[in-house]
């Protein structure tokens, strides 16, 4: 994912200015690029620290520039390092004096494991001295003075990874500053193989691209791109996506490009020579002009791009007919995306011909992690790669890169992702009012933790002890009313805030629990209170059928009117009566009842009753005879409360007649307080007695009352008020 390029301009140092520029192309490193001396390659080189500066022309580039007067201190090995996800990518290069006695054939040389290798140095100065060759600063070989050839060679018949390193050549009397350097890179695998076991076959890397032994990907030379390095860049451009440009008058002349191993260093396409300042001869193109054009149909050969095929033809030699290849383009990808933390499915959509495949589309996180599509589809014109990040978090914010790499070329599109923290209320909602079936809630949505703005708010609620799912209501105000709640039920509430965008629902905030009011069951129906004895009253009611499963009982409260004596009795709910005992005779009691579950019910109206009397009743009082006619008269009376009077008897007879000739009228309703005697004889005197009966017996009249009827023609006397039995 890191496109790190080191430009060595110029590797052969004279008295001109020379530089090293390290570019992290199309990548946003968290850690800075570093340029340093490569003491691993050369231990005894100059110790001076390097003056590394920011390259003002590029956002992510560092530079070391040596002025001409510093030429003597430049010789040696250097590296450029970029770190991504804690992993370092290091590119190595060398600088040497142009006046050295020997010069290398190439700055670097990449070979496969097992190759037959000749490392060669060209003799520039003739001296009467032995020639010596060192590897990584350690002596390995010498050539006697009279045998030093024009081309000094180190022969490795069967190259192994341990043979890799910086080889230097000089005369024995020379030193580091008169040495020539070349670096041998030995791929860990044999030709065309890659993988930990070197058992995978490399993609055919064209245009002198090199197969990376760890990934199988082609490292393309400067000026080519794509999965197979077949696609030539526009003139004077380089980098994995050809986005970087050589700013010199003659393009990339005098720029030696060093790429991560196993590529090494080469000129940009169209140039050759140790200083990359020589143009390719006609018929040749590519890095170091090593590629030969063999264009079909007399097509033109361009030293930078190779064969320039006519429309309808393609291939390195324009040998294939077919639709012209189109460099992929990333479409419909905004520059900035705001994402809510949690699951994220970014989409990368690309056009091009051939259409990019699943394996050719990747997504690179800011930390350098390369993601591969979890889902992929394509239409006639576009490929769509869908990636899955199971949990994206704020630290993942930054520049992400959608990368498409096909045979037709490579394109990367950086875009900024801002990961937002989902909002969550800091406080539980408050219940500001509640009854038995409703609650008024202040949802307390602010303050909240996380990012706004808040798009919507949800109040979640459920009964605590029921296995019910959370119910929710969308709320717009801070105050919300929940209706249709159950009485005497514990509920829990919490608030969920939602911010804009997919997956914007935050975690529910703290939970508030509350209970609705108990609602009392109605009192028992058909309550009736009657005396049973001198010390007991009987309370009865209709059977109770409660609507809920709750256990219930009937609570009966009885209190004496005369004395401060109260008692509460619990009666099992399946009974329909209770005998109130241990009472006092001839005493009035007030009784009420309610049906209780865990909650108390509503009290009934008061019922009053007297216990039965323990003495004879007193005589009725205020006895009056009125409204007398020739054949009738009205008798009225009052009785005292509390003597369990059950009936009143009126006894009358014509005066002077025998005792046994009396008439008894028994009034069984003791609440009736007057009675009309009928069928009397005109102008006749009657003797009237009235007495009360209770559970003990009858009252004793002290005296009799006299009644004389009128002659037939006279009008009746006035009738007194009160209840009357006719």
């Amino acid at each position: 994912a890191m496109d790190l390029i080191l430009i060595n301009s110029l590797p052969l140092v004279s008295d001109a200015e020379t530089s090293l520029t390290c570019i992290a192309s199309g990548w946003r490193p968290h850690e800075p690029i570093t340029i340093g001396r490569d003491f691993e390659a050369l231990m005894n080189q100059h110790q001076d620290p390097l003056e590394v500066t920011q390259d003002v022309t590029r956002e992510w580039a560092k530079k070391v520039v040596w002025k001409r007067e510093k030429a003597s201190k430049i010789n040696g090995a250097y590296f450029c390092e970029g770190r991504v996800r804690g992993e370092a990518i290091r590119i190595r290069t060398m600088k040497m004096r142009q006046q050295a006695s020997f010069l290398p054939a190439t700055l670097t040389m990449t070979v496969d494991k097992g190759d037959n290798v000749n490392i060669s140095f060209k003799k520039v100065l003739i001296k009467e001295e032995d020639a010596v060759i060192y590897k990584n600063g350690s002596f390995i070989h010498s050539v006697p003075r009279h045998e030093v050839p024009d081309i000094l060679e180190v022969h490795l018949p069967h190259a192994q990874p341990q043979d890799a390193g910086v080889y230097s050549a000089r005369y024995i009397g020379g030193n580091l500053f008169t040495s020539a350097f070349t670096r041998l890179i030995v791929r860990r695998c044999e030709a065309q193989k890659w993988g930990p076991e070197c058992n995978h076959l490399c993609t055919a890397c064209m245009n002198n691209g090199v197969c990376h032994e760890d990934t199988g990907e082609c490292i393309c030379p400067p000026g080519f791109m794509g999965r197979t390095c077949e696609k030539a860049c526009e003139l004077h451009t380089f980098g994995r996506t050809c986005k970087e440009r050589c700013s010199g008058q003659e393009g990339c002349k005098s720029y030696v490009f060093c790429l991560p191993d196993p590529y090494g260093c080469s000129c940009a396409t169209g140039w050759k020579g140790l200083q990359c300042n020589e143009a390719c001869h006609p018929g040749f193109y590519g890095p170091d002009c090593k590629l030969r054009c063999s264009c079909n149909n007399g097509e033109m050969c361009d030293r930078f791009q190779g064969c320039l095929c006519s429309p309808g033809w393609q291939g390195l030699q324009c040998e294939r007919e077919g639709i012209q290849r189109m460099t992929p383009k990333i479409v419909d990808l905004p520059d900035h995306i705001e994402v809510n933390s949690g699951k994220f499915n970014p989409i990368c959509k690309a056009s091009g011909w051939p259409l990019p495949t699943n394996e050719e589309m990747t997504l690179v996180k800011p930390d350098g992690t390369v993601l591969h599509p979890k889902d992929f589809n394509h239409t006639d014109h576009f490929s769509v790669a869908i990636f899955t990040i199971h949990r994206i978090l704020p630290p993942d914010s930054g520049v992400w890169v959608c990368s498409v790499n096909t045979v037709a070329g490579m394109v990367e599109k950086p875009f900024n992702i801002s990961v937002k923290v989902l909002p969550k209320p800091l406080n539980a909602p408050n219940v500001i009012d509640t009854g038995h079936n409703f609650a008024v809630i202040n949802i307390s949505s602010e303050p909240y933790f996380g990012d706004g703005p808040i798009k919507s708010k949800k109040l979640l609620y459920k009964p605590v002890n029921h296995y019910e799912a959370w119910q929710h209501i969308q709320v717009t105000n801070e105050i919300v009313t929940l209706n249709y709640l159950e009485p005497r039920t514990e509920y829990e509430l919490c608030v969920q805030l939602v911010r804009r965008g997919e997956g914007g629902e935050g975690h529910p905030g703290p939970v508030r629990r509350f209970t609705t009011a108990s609602i009392g069951l109605p009192p028992p129906r058909g309550l009736n209170l009657l005396p049973k004895s001198q010390t007991t009253l009987n309370l009865t009611w209709q059977p109770i059928f409660p609507s809920s499963e709750d256990d219930f009982y009937v609570e009966v409260e009885r209190r004496s009117v005369q004395k401060s004596d109260q008692q509460n009795i619990k009666v099992p709910g399946n009974l329909t009566s209770v005998l109130l005992n241990n009472l006092h005779p001839r005493e009035q009691y007030v009784v009420r009842a309610r049906v209780n579950t865990k909650a108390q019910g509503e009290w009934s109206e008061d019922l009053t009753a007297w216990t039965l009397s323990d003495i004879l009743p007193p005589q009725p009082e205020n006895i009056k005879i009125s409204n007398i006619t020739h054949s009738s008269a009205v008798i009225s009376w009052t009785i005292l409360d509390g003597y369990s009077i059950s009936s009143i008897t009126i006894r009358y007879k014509v005066q002077g007649k025998n005792e046994d000739q009396h008439v008894d009228v028994k009034i069984k309703n003791a609440t009736i307080t007057q009675y009309q005697l009928k069928g009397l004889e005109p102008e006749t005197a009657y003797q009237v007695d009235i007495f009360a009966e209770n559970n003990i017996g009858s009252s004793n009249p002290a005296f009799s009352h006299e009644l004389v009827t009128l002659p037939e023609s006279q009008a009746p006397a006035d009738l007194g008020g009160g209840k009357m039995l006719l």
Partner: antibody, heavy 117, light 109 residues
Framework: DVQLVESGGGVVRPGESLRLSCAAS????????MNWVRQAPGEGLEWVSR????????YYADSVKGRFTVSRDNSKNTLYLQMNNLRAEDTAVYYC??????????WGLGTLVTVSL | EIVLTQSPGTLILSPGERATLSCRAS???????LAWYQQKPGQAPRLLIY???NRAADIPDRFSGSGSGTDFTLTITRLEPEDFAVYYC??????????FGGGTKVEIK
């Protein structure tokens, strides 16, 4: 700041009536359930009555049911307690209290009601 | 109704001492529906603790509540002179009625 100020206390005879008021300020009175809590001299606290802010639904302690009536006038931010048929055992300081989550987060200073012959 | 019993009736302590007040419910108060109030002579009660253990606004952290079910405790870690008062617990789990404990008086030794 939430403020609750009771008034209307005094000395009455048993069987007589009295009306207490509680003026509220500093919060959205009409939204909150309000309560009366009393404290007899030298005794503990006793919840008396509660009225909902929403629909005026009322609750009473058994000791006052049928004799006391709680009401409110949301337009005046005032809570009332009409006490009829007063008994000697109703003698107490009567506090008006605001409800939050069914506990009492703010209390008035109280008004003394004395019932004696 | 739920009956709350507070103990001891009176607690006689010196400033700086730790006070532990108990409140016992006649039946379980699910999920800590219990509040504590402080009342000084001639003043209205003041909310100290709600939901058994949450301090009300502006209440010093020497006051703490704990407990669940039927047994609850109010602890004052270091008594200050202004802490000598009567303390009441109140349940709001099963209502009406909302019930109070009989109170614990914390007296200065």
């Amino acid at each position: 700041d939430v403020q609750l100020v009771e008034s209307g206390g005094g000395v009455v005879r048993p069987g007589e009536s009295l009306r207490l008021s509680c003026a509220a300020s500093g919060f959205s009175f009409s939204l909150y359930a309000m309560n009366w809590v009393r404290q007899a001299p030298g005794e503990g606290l006793e919840w008396v009555s509660r009225i909902s802010g929403r629909d005026g639904y009322t609750y009473y302690a058994d000791s006052v049911k049928g004799r006391f009536t709680v009401s409110r006038d949301n337009s005046k931010n005032t809570l009332y307690l009409q006490m009829n048929n007063l008994r000697a055992e109703d003698t107490a300081v009567y506090y008006c209290a605001k409800t939050l989550n069914n506990f009492f987060d703010y209390w008035g200073l109280g008004t003394l009601v004395t019932v004696s012959l | 109704e739920i009956v709350l019993t507070q103990s001891p009736g009176t607690l006689i302590l010196s400033p700086g001492e730790r006070a532990t007040l108990s409140c016992r419910a006649s039946q379980s108060i699910s999920n800590t529906y219990l509040a504590w109030y402080q009342q000084k002579p001639g003043q209205a009660p003041r909310l100290l603790i709600y939901d058994a253990s949450n301090r009300a606004a502006d209440i010093p952290d020497r006051f703490s509540g704990s407990g669940s079910g039927t047994d609850f405790t109010l602890t004052i870690t270091r008594l200050e002179p202004e802490d000598f008062a009567v303390y009441y617990c109140q349940q709001y789990y099963d209502w009406p009625p909302l019930t109070f404990g009989g109170g614990t008086k914390v007296e200065i030794k």
